[in-house]
Amino acid sequence: ALDTNYCFRNLEENCCVRPLYIDFRQDLGWKWVHEPKGYYANFCSGPCPYLRSADTTHSTVLGLYNTLNPEASASPCCVPQDLEPLTILYYVGRTPKVEQLSNMVVKSCKCS
Amino acid sequence: ALDTNYCFRNLEENCCVRPLYIDFRQDLGWKWVHEPKGYYANFCSGPCPYLRSADTTHSTVLGLYNTLNPEASASPCCVPQDLEPLTILYYVGRTPKVEQLSNMVVKSCKCS
């Protein structure tokens, strides 16, 4: 699986999850998030050669088409597969609130 | 929606579904498919600027990050959203068989 366990331990050029730390205030302009100050959102990147973690029949077909037609511009792309939520603390005035934000952290990637 | 209705009628540079005809024999080397000879598989391509048909909170966050950090290499990618099956005819010996292959045709795209 193209997950953090594999991708963060290997120098993988092809589609894999990559570490990306986002600072809420500096990178997003979100002043309302109190904690954490930032988090590892991660992202997916890298080429999708034929049969690499293909998501659907279409991505397999497209990968094969690309292999047999190297000049073609159509190829699968490396995108998130599994995402996890992030728990944040914010304030409504002076009152603290805890919220779980869904689909915030990429844990694995696929070729789609 | 970034679907065939919209994308095939407009000269859209950003993420959209593009027409791609695949000939089973010539492009894939699939001699076993008798009918059709080929089909419009289509594919997704084009940049994913901030907020363009974002798939999840993560892709929106990544798009925002990319907007505020233009030098960043992390950005959402244009991939299939809705896929449709394709019905094919093939032969087992002299016996014709009809099969529905799932997820063969891209109908719309998203930024993921």
């Epitope: 309302w32 005035g93 009152t95 | 909170t57 929106t60």
Partner: antibody, heavy 120, light 108 residues
């Protein structure tokens, strides 16, 4: 610099609903927190609630809970305020405003206002 | 909910004079949860002061805010003709956000 452009004036019957839109341009929409404030004719200002775009966290004044819904559509950089079960005392100018960044905060940029008249 | 009481209700002064507007909260707001706005007829409010004493961008330095706890003041050191308007204080320490009833500053 943020510009907030609101939808036009509305005349509504008692018991009906109204949905006012507020389109943002300028500073990135999803870095803003948007509040809604109303002002009855010749009266003061009254906060109704606010929303954090992207994550759609909304906070409402208790007196409007169950009657007001504030949502954000990131794809169009637009915030909506829907008020249901309208009565004559809901006749007011409705403003959207971007806060300085917190959920409850001072409001630095304001829309031009939308007059909602509730009359039978 | 926190009630804000502004005084006076109306203030009649001449250009060049000093204006002092008061805002009292029904409970302590700390030192940084109060804002002041100016509103002219037919216009949206305009933020003058936030955090009790910080001037918003583009606001002339004749406007100043002070105070903490329950008592806050907006001072306009030398009134200009364009300063005659209605002024509101706003608290954002607790939900719901509340506004004072306003002080009308009129030309004497």
């Amino acid at each position: 610099q943020v510009q907030l452009v609101q939808s036009g004036a509305e005349v509504k019957k008692p018991g009906s609903s109204v949905k006012v839109s507020c389109k943002a341009s300028g500073k990135t929409f999803s870095s803003n927190v948007i509040s809604w404030v109303r002002q009855a004719p010749g009266q003061g200002l009254e906060w109704m609630g606010g929303v954090i775009p992207i994550v759609d966290i909304a906070n409402y004044a208790q007196r409007f809970k169950g009657r007001v819904t504030i949502t954000a559509d990131e794809s169009t950089s637009t915030t909506y305020m829907e008020l249901s079960s309208l009565r004559s005392e809901d006749t007011a100018v409705y403003y959207c405003a971007s806060t300085l960044g917190l959920v409850l905060d001072a409001m630095d940029y304001w829309g031009q206002g939308t007059l909602v008249t509730v009359s039978s | 909910e926190t009630v804000l009481t502004q005084s006076p209700g109306t203030l009649s002064l001449s250009p060049g004079e000093r204006a002092t507007l008061s805002c009292r909260a029904s409970q302590s707001l700390g030192s940084s949860y109060l804002a002041w706005y100016q509103q002219k007829p037919g216009q949206a409010p305009r933020l003058l002061i936030y955090g009790a004493s910080s001037r918003a961008p583009g606001i002339p330095d004749r406007f100043s805010g002070s105070g903490s706890g329950t008592d806050f003041t907006l001072t306009i050191s030398r009134l200009e003709p364009e300063d005659f308007a209605v002024y509101y204080c706003q608290q954002y320490a607790d939900s719901p956000i509340t506004f004072g009833q306003g002080t009308r500053l009129e030309i004497k």
